[in-house]
């Protein structure tokens, strides 16, 4: 089948990194600089993506594969193929329309991107707070007070909703 196809269409013999040049008797010509063909049998090479402006090159374009971009330092990618760059914030912050803002009490963000999320409410699982939450870290839930033998607990049982370690009600 391959042989039949190549007899019918000489372009099918052109490998990735080349194109079937109609101006030169359909011979396989290498892709020109700043272009690529990722599959065989192509009649043109595609132009390489430029990683300029807020984008920077993560992977250079080659004759067989397109360039890949990421974002300049202090920014991270959004969208398919890194189609937008968004400013990083510090851990314990989230990006709002007014810039980076600290997480509100009862929420945390342990990354440089994304939004602040509520602390885990340990009491919903019948557990107690082992380690209090911060702006950068979620609470750590421990065994439920009932699981601990009397006198052995160093953990205070869940109390009013405003106590650190609980999501605001």
């Amino acid at each position: 089948f391959e042989r039949t196809r190549s007899l019918q269409d000489p372009c099918s013999n052109c490998p990735a990194g080349t194109f079937c040049d109609n101006n030169r008797n359909q011979i396989c010509s290498p892709c020109p600089p700043n272009s690529f063909s990722s599959a065989g049998g192509q009649r043109t090479c595609d132009i390489c993506r430029q990683c300029k402006g807020v984008f920077r090159t993560r992977k250079e374009c080659s004759s067989t594969s397109n360039a890949e971009c990421d974002c300049t330092p202090g920014f991270h990618c959004l969208g398919a193929g890194c189609s937008m760059c968004e400013q990083d914030c510090k851990q314990g912050q989230e990006l709002t329309k007014k810039g980076c803002k600290d997480c509100c009490f009862g929420t945390f963000n342990d990354q440089k991107r994304g939004i602040c999320r509520p602390w885990t409410n340990c009491s919903l699982d019948g557990k107690s707070v082992l380690v209090n939450g911060t702006k950068e870290r979620d609470v750590v839930c421990g065994p439920s007070p009932a699981d601990l033998s009397p006198g052995a607990s160093s953990v205070t049982p869940p109390a009013p909703a405003r106590e650190p370690g609980h999501s605001p009600q």
Epitope: I47, G53, K97, G99
Partner: antibody, heavy 115, light 107 residues
Amino acid sequence: QVQLQQWGAGLLKPSETLSLTCAVYGGSFSGYYWSWIRQPPGKGLEWIGEIIHSGSTDSNPSLKGRVTFSVDTSKNQFSLKLNSVTAADTAVYYCARLTGPFDYWGQGTLVTVSS
Amino acid sequence: EIVMTQSPATLSVSPGERATLSCRASQSISSILAWYQQKPGQAPRLLIYGASTRATGIPARFSGSGSGTEFTLTISSLQSEDFAVYYCQQYYNWPLTFGGGTKVEIK
């Protein structure tokens, strides 16, 4: 909220220099690329060029040689100068933030070139 | 430079109907394409980036699709505030270029 506010002379004579400034309020200034785009009356949009806080620039080859960008990081402002203007440069000029696409825009300034 | 071509130049649609706008690139631009809405006397507003991702605060009735050279912006049910001019823009390669725009008007 990120806001871009722009100003500059609205009426020029041929051969004069167009000068516009854009101030950025809210959000971060450094790290972003800041662009200028223009729109002739009743027509489409044309990218003029861009500058980053460090002063690095890029511009449309169709305007190269006539366009200059500058930045004042102490005021969170960037500026455009276009020299030797003609009637073909009559347009609404916009400043915008470049994050890949243009996600925030200034209100636009109509610049008319007429003798 | 990459030339962006939009069609139709004008689209007449009744409120509540679906609007489909097309944008074609002269060369493949993967999905590195944005759509903007512009109302008279206003600056353009970003609707879609990466060909299909809605920008912050953009209603779900706006959707983008396509890859390579053919792209579509669909407004599923036109509201009165959607009558405007829409532009596509590639940022795959410099210089950055825009399409000529599609005016969506009330039928």
